[in-house]
């Protein structure tokens, strides 16, 4: 049976076996054509998603879709049902959590006040004054909270306490990217952890230990890219795994939330990398032990130099690592989060592609995971 | 230097196929994407797929699906595109370029398809 | 697929002058866009990509502008050997699409 299911993939009628390699070759093997069914998908970017969050104190603003313009939710007469809409057009499927914060000094959009329309925020008609003062802070998820802070060193053994929204993507049981949990259902990785093996049955998920193979596997239900850019073959390198069942969140699984939509870090804001991955480059071996390190934003321009990256990494890609080298992720880190301290942890990269590993002028490239909020939240709304 | 060579013009009659190659030198073959992009005579430029030669995958316009096929030889550093069904539309210059950054930086001459009874 | 127009279609000038063309796309495009000069009987040759980063060998009087959905090229002190016919190309997502061209001609 073992060895059946390994080399093997059982078409329905009439019932008969087919190699294994034949899965999401693009060919119909099967007569009803399920070989090619639970592959990797990919997803559009699709049309813009009418709200957002600002990272100005997780602040709600709505898009008036006839001209274009953005603008911020008054608190006045924000409701529940409202919060749960504006959530929902975001893909989220928990109980979300609001409050009003006072109108800044720096408040560049106009305030409206905000009403529904067939299950989409809209702005009142005859919107007045904000009489509150006050703006929507809005949170759909709680994420972003773990058990222990880590301390601010190079490169360390890191415990599940600390970065409890790691899992481990593995294939056959073999470890081969890391990723983010995101919510109940879904985990955030890269595309190209993806590229060898398409057909969604044989990956499987490691949520809530440190070490590499000591924790129950959980099935996936689909795997979804973004379009293929062939232009920027190293762009658009994004995936989200939706889980078969939902996780049941603890201290050691725990999701971490999705950047805000205005989040530009500059250049040497402290960051930090996790993962399994190899600790030297061609060092032929994963660590079994989670590891975690701190480094910082590097500019795009100096990425971007003649002796770096000579202008292949896109707005849609940010750098990281330490000015002098030798702290980077590595071959198997890829797919793991690139994260963000504020109030939460916040998942700003996705580890994603670089030339060797710790090169001082060659740092780590990184998915830059606020240029496809809009991709997540339509890929979740359609699988909600 | 880095160069891409075309194989020389071709005629053809309606319906059959003809194949183009592309041969590279002068840079590590399987690092970058080729290209294929098209121009009818007096007319603008129209892409019509990609190949890895590294991995071998590819891509084609909509356009062309089905009708186009690319493949390469990494003995030889040359990419191939083939175009069956032709029709007198597809009288055009082919040429392959390489991927660079969003752009393409080399072109191959240009190989000359006429299509014609 | 994402529309590129340019205008003008075509344009006369002369040896010193300079010269703009724009290129609008039908949608966002960040700044994912690539300028190409062609010049009779020969292949396109690249001079900006990511609308404004010169690619290398290509002369200073050559210049990108542009994001979103409106682009410029420019050329400062127009040459003879810069009267050819230029291309907009966007790479924001496949299929990559053209303008369909503004010939400069000489006055």
């Known amino acids: 049976k073992v060895i059946l299911d390994k080399y093997y993939f059982l078409c329905g009628q009439p019932l008969h076996f087919i190699p294994r390699k034949q899965l999401c070759d693009g060919e119909l093997d099967c007569p009803l054509g399920e070989d090619e069914e639970h592959c990797v998908k990919s997803f559009p970017e699709g049309p813009a998603v009418a709200v957002r969050l600002s990272k100005d104190r997780s602040t709600l603003q709505v898009l008036d879709s006839a001209t274009g313009n953005w603008f911020s939710a008054c608190f006045d007469n924000f409701t529940e049902a409202l919060a749960e809409t504006a959530c929902r057009q975001m893909g989220y499927s928990s109980k979300p959590t609001f409050r009003a914060v006072e109108i800044g000094p720096d408040q560049d959009l106009d305030v409206v006040e905000i009403t529904e329309n067939s299950q989409e925020l809209r702005m009142r008609n005859s919107s007045g004054p904000c009489l509150s003062g006050s703006l929507v802070s809005l949170h759909c998820l709680a994420c972003g909270k773990s058990l222990k802070t880590p301390r601010v060193v190079g490169v360390e053994e890191a415990s599940v306490d600390s970065w409890p929204w790691q899992v481990s993507i593995q294939y056959d049981k073999q470890h081969v990217c890391g990723g983010s949990i995101l919510d109940p259902h879904w985990v955030l990785t890269a595309a190209h952890c993806f590229r060898k093996h398409t057909d969604v049955f044989n990956w499987k998920v490691r949520a809530g230990s440190d070490k590499l193979g000591s924790f129950p596997s959980l099935a996936v239900a689909k795997i979804i890219i973004i379009e293929f850019n062939p232009m920027y073959p190293k762009d658009n390198d994004i995936a989200l795994m939706k889980l078969q069942f939902p996780l049941t969140f603890s201290g050691t699984v725990r999701p971490i939330c999705l950047p805000f939509f205005d989040e530009e870090l500059t250049p040497a804001t402290p960051l930090w990398i996790i993962g399994w991955g190899f600790t030297k480059q061609n060092g032929g071996k994963m660590s079994d032990i989670l590891l975690q390190a701190s480094v910082q934003v590097i500019d795009s321009t100096r990425c971007n130099a003649d002796d770096a990256y000579q202008g292949e990494v896109t707005e849609k890609m940010m750098c990281a690592g330490i000015p002098e080298g030798g702290v980077d992720t590595c071959q198997g880190d890829s797919g793991g989060p690139l994260m963000y301290q504020s109030d939460q942890w916040h998942v700003v990269g996705i580890v994603s592609w670089g030339y060797g590993c710790g090169g001082p002028s060659t740092p780590g490239v990184y998915t830059k995971v606020s240029a496809y909020l809009n991709w997540i939240y339509n890929v979740w709304k359609a699988e909600l | 230097q880095v160069q891409l060579v075309q194989s020389g013009a071709e005629v053809k009659k309606p319906g059959a196929s003809v194949k183009v190659s592309c041969k590279a030198s002068?840079?590590?073959?399987?690092?970058?994407?080729i290209h294929w992009v098209r121009q009818a005579p007096g007319q603008g430029l129209e892409w019509m797929g990609w190949m890895s030669p590294n991995s071998g995958d590819t891509g084609y316009a909509q356009k062309f699906q089905g009708r186009v096929t690319m493949t390469r030889d990494t003995s030889t550093s040359t990419v191939y595109m083939e175009l069956s069904s032709l029709r007198s539309e597809d009288t055009a210059v082919y040429y392959c370029?390489?991927?660079?950054?969003?752009?393409?930086?080399?072109w191959g001459q240009g190989t000359l398809v006429t299509v014609s009874s | 697929d994402i529309q590129m127009t340019q205008s003008p279609s075509s344009l006369s000038a002369s040896v010193g002058d300079r010269v703009t063309i724009t290129c609008r796309a039908s949608?966002?495009?960040?700044?994912?866009l690539n300028w190409y000069q062609q010049k009779p009987g020969k292949a396109p040759k690249l001079l900006i990509y990511a609308a404004s980063r010169l690619q290398s060998g290509v002369p200073s009087r050559f210049s990108g502008s542009g994001s979103g959905t409106d682009f410029t090229l420019t050329i400062s002190s127009l040459q003879p050997e810069d009267f050819a016919t230029y291309y907009c190309q966007q790479s924001y997502r496949s299929p990559p699409t053209f303008g369909q061209g503004t010939k400069l001609e000489i006055k």
């Open positions: 002068g840079y590590t073959f399987t690092s970058y994407y």
């Open positions: 370029a390489r991927l660079v950054r969003g752009g393409f930086d080399y």
């Open positions: 949608q966002g495009i960040s700044s994912y």
